[in-house]
Amino acid sequence: GPAKSPYQLVLQHSRLRGRQHGPNVCAVQKVIGTNRKYFTNCKQWYQRKICGKSTVISYECCPGYEKVPGEKGCPAALPLSNLYETLGVVGSTTTQLYTDRTEKLRPEMEGPGSFTIFAPSNEAWASLPAEVLDSLVSNVNIELLNALRYHMVGRRVLTDELKHGMTLTSMYQNSNIQIHHYPNGIVTVNCARLLKADHHATNGVVHLIDKVISTITNNIQQIIEIEDTFETLRAAVAASGLNTMLEGNGQYTLLAPTNEAFEKIPSETLNRILGDPEALRDLLNNHILKSAMCAEAIVAGLSVETLEGTTLEVGCSGDMLTINGKAIISNKDILATNGVIHYIDELLIPDSAKTLFELAAESDVSTAIDLFRQAGLGNHLSGSERLTLLAPLNSVFKDGTPPIDAHTRNLLRNHIIKDQLASKYLYHGQTLETLGGKKLRVFVYRNSLCIENSCIAAHDKRGRYGTLFTMDRVLTPPMGTVMDVLKGDNRFSMLVAAIQSAGLTETLNREGVYTVFAPTNEAFRALPPRERSRLLGDAKELANILKYHIGDEILVSGGIGALVRLKSLQGDKLEVSLKNNVVSVNKEPVAEPDIMATNGVVHVITNVLQPPANRPQERGDELADSALEIFKQASAFSRASQRSVRLAPVYQKLLERMKH
């Protein structure tokens, strides 16, 4: 058959939960301390909460059924009677009472024809302000008749026909009734919630609703123009040209900021936005949802997208509606012909209308922002240059911040890219130019996106002119080739000598993408003398082992994830892992990761890595003396030719360093 509507699916779930109590029993969740009842969906059933409030489960007859004394559950279908009597069956006795008062309406309800009545519950009538009720019952009850006719449709309409966003023609002057049927199974009629649906009558159907509904006459734009509290909003809408949309056809939700909401914003910020058509349009669009959303539809947190593109978390806490967790909605469900308005007393400024400073204020990068400000770079973060700010997280500076000197200023200038970027468009190998004149490289890994040694730690915040990238560490631009890095650090003097004697200098000086696991002098000294002599006594062997320390792509620590198998220039793979923020290669910890070079990255290690081929038994273990001598004679020529390499001047440097 046809797909079930969300309402029917929720009803089905409630029936399922109630079936152990007998046939046609539905589980109902009642919010403690109120009379609000809901058929229950799966999520609510397990959370036992509606709008953050605890609920109790009760078991009632499903719509259209009744109990039979002495029998389990609700085995009997309700007897069909006319609409008037069915009002009594569903508990809408006040509607019956007011129907009687109109004199004309009861005969219609009892007579031939086919109607739908959206009948307000007794509580709905009782909650009407006294003056409204008075005006309905005065004027020879004509207002009451009109009000009741507005709750009626001249044909039978069941819930499976109530589609989201549809309008029904009422029996009062053919005025429209707005229907919304939400994915969570809630159905609203002019934002009044359907409590008990599909109660059949001989001449139609009754749906019980939780409010008395009234005709909708104004569109959203007209409401903005009428209400004094929207004076600032009115001016902003006019300036942005959005009034055409807000008076046109469609179904929108306007989260309408009151004058008070605008007053909470610093005048400098407000004037900047109001004076910038694009920022203003984004600001207003961030208050408009693409469909009508009645307050009654919200029973738990819900992510909704604004016309501007930002996602808002709409939720509820008891009777209060919340946006992004804050109860800022002061008046809800003001109906318009083209949607619904909720008054809000805080402005929802989207990122797209903010400066870099404003973006950063809501991110965990305040320490970095203070540094930029102290370094005299503040004008870049509040101006209209197209920039991307690479701002390290506050946690990066937990051990203190650097003094603001020329070096720090330059470093900070290299955290500002001369273009407004979006991380989703960055690609591996891309270069980005900084205000400091450096070219930074982009590295794309399976689970991270890095710029040099620093990786993006949070979603971009794209502002009006600048984008904020929150980074996981201070970015260090490369200062030279891998060879320059090694030569410039006296911890690597033995490695440099070894690289030179192995003929790898040119490789590590030319353009390329290398990850070098660089053993310190201590690492060489820590080798057993035999292994050190094997390594340094044979140029070919030395080159082989050194190549095993060089990966054939750039792998910064942020790109490792849990485990990466990195192919070395020697051919075997290196197992690089990250655990508890410590990088390891072949299970040995890296002493200092991420020293960036123009052609790669250097990770400092305190041990010399041994390729798999170097780990098996030695010749001496298996060969007898005579066999060894034969082997040596056979390889005498190759050794003789290598001797000149072994005695190369570079070894003289090593000699001094290796001396015990």
Partner: antibody, heavy 120, light 113 residues
Framework: QVQLVESGGGLVKPGGSLRLSCAAS????????MYWIRQAPGKGLEWVAT????????YYADSVKGRFTISRDSAKNSLYLQMNSLRAEDTAVYYC?????????????WGQGTTVTVSS | DIVMTQSPDSLAVSLGERATMNCKSS????????????LAWYQQKPGQPPKLLIY???TRESGVPDRFSGSGSGTDFTLTISSLQAEDVAVYYC?????????FGQGTKLEIK
């Protein structure tokens, strides 16, 4: 077969010098690490110095560093130990020792030793 | 420096009996990259230079009788002579070649009971 013959030992006054030599035969001298090891009268063994096959890498015990110099002459198949500023505690039998192979290793072949006595 | 300690200092064993001596190093001699122990055993008979018996803690030098065997790993090592012969009377030294300076144990003197 492998032969290592030490010479140059003798009696010397404290502060004096001696040069020990070791003549190697029966193997390709330039393919092996070589060592000097000593043994004081009635005592255990003590490593003194190491020189690599090409003569590039040299290591000394702290007790002789700055006073002794190990060297080799592959053309003459000879190993040397120049001992200066000799002390009474340098009195020992000095053994010339060949390593297992062209890499630094254990002490595979030993000479008969030459005695050095430092006494006034 | 790595300190090598041998025990016992002297040992008297009957001919044909098993002789066992121990050597303990102040730090591990096991190199994780190749899983080898950098330890050798030497025999020195009176008036003679020492002679290599065992290297890599357990590999017998060619020409050494198979009654000699080495075992152990890390810091604790053992030299065993399965059936003592008269010509085995000597002082036995262990030596580490894991770190400079290379160091020897003080020796274990083996005699016939």
């Amino acid at each position: 077969q492998v032969q290592l013959v030490e010479s140059g030992g003798g009696l010397v006054k404290p502060g004096g010098s001696l040069r020990l030599s070791c003549a190697a035969s029966g193997f390709t001298f330039s393919d092996y690490y070589m060592y000097w090891i000593r043994q004081a009268p009635g005592k255990g063994l003590e490593w003194v110095a190491t020189i690599s096959d090409g003569g590039i890498y040299i290591y000394y015990a702290d007790s002789v560093k700055g006073r002794f110099t190990i060297s080799r002459d592959s053309a003459k198949n000879s190993l040397y130990l120049q001992m200066n500023s000799l002390r009474a505690e340098d009195t020992a039998v000095y053994y010339c020792v060949r390593g297992w192979d062209r890499y630094d290793s254990w002490f595979a072949c030993w000479g008969q030793g030459t005695t050095v006595t430092v006494s006034s | 420096d790595i300190v090598m300690t041998q025990s016992p200092d002297s040992l008297a064993v009957s001919l044909g009996e098993r002789a066992t001596m121990n050597c303990k190093s102040s730090q591990s001699l096991l190199y994780s990259s190749n899983q080898k122990n950098y330890l050798a055993w030497y025999q020195q008979k009176p008036g003679q230079p020492p002679k290599l018996l065992i290297y890599w803690a357990s590999t017998r030098e060619s020409g050494v009788p198979d009654r000699f065997s080495g075992s152990g790993s890390g810091t604790d090592f053992t030299l065993t002579i399965s059936s003592l012969q008269a010509e085995d009377v000597a002082v036995y030294y262990c030596q580490q070649y894991y770190r400079y300076p290379y160091t020897f144990g003080q020796g274990t003197k083996l005699e016939i009971k």
